[in-house]
């Protein structure tokens, strides 16, 4: 967190806290995490630590939703102090605050080893894609706390962290929505999301990521009681994730190839595709399913897994080369990602310096193409579109905040994958 002028305060998830102020953080998809205490320190940093629970000297300790530690029945607070939390309704079923459940059909890009985990918190439903660990037994069982099946005997304790861990401020909420778009899913071995596993429905312990823990990506979307999809758009009965693009399907015309719609949070934004005025061949041809004409028989130089037409267009959008340079020295990694543009003819270079997983420095430079040509070690990694670059820079802004206060091992590598364009299926993008 940056210290702002003379009056020091902390910013945490878009809220201001005074120095010395304490609170329980609100972390999606868990809601208020009562087992974590946060405090705003004098230098404007948020320090959070897990609550250490005292040993309970009774046979049947009771878990109370708004208290972290289990209590003996005789030491419970009076009933009138009880916090009444709103329940949630989803798909005709009512869920209590803190309850976890499984949903289907929310994420179009769900992998076979992923499931959709939802939780009810303060009247809102939070859902995430959860990558399940590889199962090492023949007959896995379902558990109430997770949409993943587990081997008998696994899972109960493995999700616990040691008490009293200190961790730095997690990124603000948006940081965990935006850059894990529908364009890719990091491989299960990668830790890409801000949060890892879901804790038990009764205990919020273990809700925060341990960088050593092998677990999957969480991509949250938010659904409120009225079934509105938070980070998704619905068009013509189809659900699209934030950042996903499609050609609209209009009843009278069918699929309109010359219009490209993009899901921006919950709004769909559509724009007309502009075809090139001049082609490098005399007789460009119209092809079914493509908006712009293409030159026959001339294939653009293809990069693995990508298809561009002759002018380096992808789904009607111009593509630009992306270069990368990674340099390691004295335990410090400098990663440079560069986008070359034609108008203006220049190169935008994003420079990341990371030491021991913590972001030391991040900045953006613009230099001329001539200057860029002087620089060694840059390798062409892909071509991308301006809209993908925009998604990349938004995600980058978020993880640059996140990774300056906690260890990030693969976040940037995973984010770079946003720039890779999927091979377009015949007929639509």
């Amino acid at each position: 967190e940056q210290v702002k002028h003379s009056e020091t305060y902390c910013m945490f998830q878009d809220k201001k806290y005074r120095v010395g102020e304490r609170w329980h953080p609100y972390l999606e998809p868990y809601g208020l995490v009562y087992c974590v205490n946060c405090i705003c320190s004098e230098n404007g940093n948020v320090l959070c630590s897990r609550v250490r629970c005292p040993n309970v000297h009774c046979l049947s300790p009771v878990h109370i939703p708004h208290l972290c530690c289990p209590r003996c029945p005789d030491s419970l607070p009076p009933v009138n102090n009880k916090v009444t939390s709103k329940s949630c309704e989803y798909n005709g079923t009512t869920y209590q605050h803190g309850e976890l459940f499984v949903a289907e059909g929310l994420f179009q890009n769900r992998q076979p080893n992923q499931c959709t985990q939802c939780s009810c918190s303060e009247g809102n439903v939070y859902c995430g894609l959860k990558t399940c660990p590889k199962l090492t037994c023949a007959f896995p069982v379902s558990v109430p706390d997770s949409c993943c099946r587990v081997c008998r005997g696994d899972g109960e304790l493995s999700w616990e962290h040691s008490d009293g861990d200190i961790f730095r401020q997690p990124a603000n909420r948006e940081a965990r929505h935006s850059y894990h778009r529908s364009h890719y899913d990091p491989p299960p071995s990668r830790q890409a999301g801000g949060l890892s596993r879901f804790p038990g429905a009764r205990s919020h312990r273990g809700a925060l990521m341990d960088s050593q823990q092998a677990s999957g990506t969480i991509v949250q979307i938010v659904i409120n009681n009225k079934h509105k999809h938070g980070q998704v758009c619905v068009s013509n009965g189809k659900t699209y994730s934030h950042g996903e693009s499609w050609h609209p399907n209009l009843r009278a015309f069918g699929i309109v190839e010359c219009v490209l719609c993009t899901c921006n949070v919950t709004k769909q934004e559509c724009k007309k595709i502009h075809c090139p005025n001049r082609y490098p061949c005399k007789y460009p041809q119209k092809i079914d399913g493509k908006c712009c004409k293409v030159c026959p028989g001339k294939k653009a130089k293809e990069l693995p897994g990508q298809s561009f037409d002759n002018k380096g267009y992808f789904c009607g959008e111009e593509t630009m080369p992306v270069y990368e340079s990674v340099f390691m020295e004295d335990g410090e990694t400098t990663r440079k990602i560069a986008l070359e543009t034609e108008r203006p003819p220049q190169v935008e270079v994003h420079v990341w310096t990371i030491r021991k997983g913590i972001l030391q420095h991040f900045h953006i430079e613009k230099i001329s193409k001539r200057m860029f040509e002087e620089l060694p070690h840059f390798k062409l990694v892909t071509r991308t579109t301006l809209s993908q670059w925009k998604i990349f820079t938004e995600g980058e802004a978020q993880i640059s905040q996140m990774c300056s206060s906690r260890v990030c091992r693969t976040e940037l590598e995973d984010l770079v994958k946003v720039l890779y364009l999927e091979r377009s299926e015949k007929g639509h993008c």
């Epitope: 020295e329 004295d330 420079v351 430079e365 001329s368 002087e374 620089l375």
Partner: antibody
């Protein structure tokens, strides 16, 4: 600490060549660009070119391209700049300068003390 | 080549004064600009890079601002050791080019 130590002053005749050295210490020599900048008496600064000490790759200012040669000796962490076909207008102080590592634009954070080259018949 | 024009070419000021030197590029160089200080018989010293980033070890009375074509170096309260010549340099395109310098003298 980072230091760039240059060779001493030289007096040359027109048409001759001069070779200026710049010995680097206090950092990993091969990890930073080395640039050469000159300054004629009472004049401004002019970059002549640079060399990548890790592979010897060079970039020369068009103005000097035909006459300048930049080299490095990795074993002694020394960079060299040789200027040939000297003329009187080449009389200047020649500096070697290292550029900041984590920036793609060239910002010179450490400079040698300078070597005065006088071209006179 | 990109031309860099500094103004004024010289100025007189007193200790404690606030001083501003400007630098104009002949085309858009975004933030790719550095400021150097040079004292007689010495090598230049980097003060500001990337238009507004203060180099390590440089006193905080020095600051840089601007982007595009117009840039400013400000010394908030002149100290005796600040009397020197100041150069701007564009690092956006090759060849790199320097301004002609601004000589800051004691009034």
């Amino acid at each position: 600490q980072v230091q760039l130590v240059q060779s001493g002053a030289e007096v040359k005749k027109p048409g001759a060549s001069v070779k200026v050295s710049c010995k680097a210490s206090g950092y990993t020599f091969t990890s930073y660009w080395m640039h050469w900048v000159r300054q004629a008496p009472g004049q401004g600064l002019e970059r002549m070119g640079n060399i990548n000490p890790s592979n010897g790759g060079t970039n020369y200012n068009e103005k000097f391209k035909s006459r300048v040669t930049m080299t490095v000796d990795k074993s002694s962490s020394t960079a060299y700049m040789e200027l040939s076909s000297l003329r009187s207008e080449d009389t200047a102080v020649y500096y070697c300068a290292r550029s900041k590592n984590n920036y793609v634009a060239y910002y010179f954070d450490y400079w040698g003390q300078g070597t005065l080259v006088t071209v006179s018949s | 080549d990109i031309q860099m024009t500094q103004s004024p070419s010289s100025l007189s000021a007193s200790v404690g004064d606030r001083v501003t030197i400007t630098c104009r590029a002949s085309e858009n160089i975004y933030y790719s600009l550095a400021w150097y200080q040079q004292k007689p018989g010495k090598a230049p010293k980097l003060l500001i890079y990337n238009a507004n980033s203060l180099e390590d070890g440089v006193p905080s009375r020095f600051s840089g601002s601007g982007s595009g074509t117009d840039f400013t170096l400000t010394i908030s309260s002149l100290q005796p050791e600040d009397f020197a010549t100041y150069y701007c340099k564009q690092a956006y395109d090759v060849p790199l080019t320097f301004g002609q310098g601004t000589k800051l003298e004691i009034k």
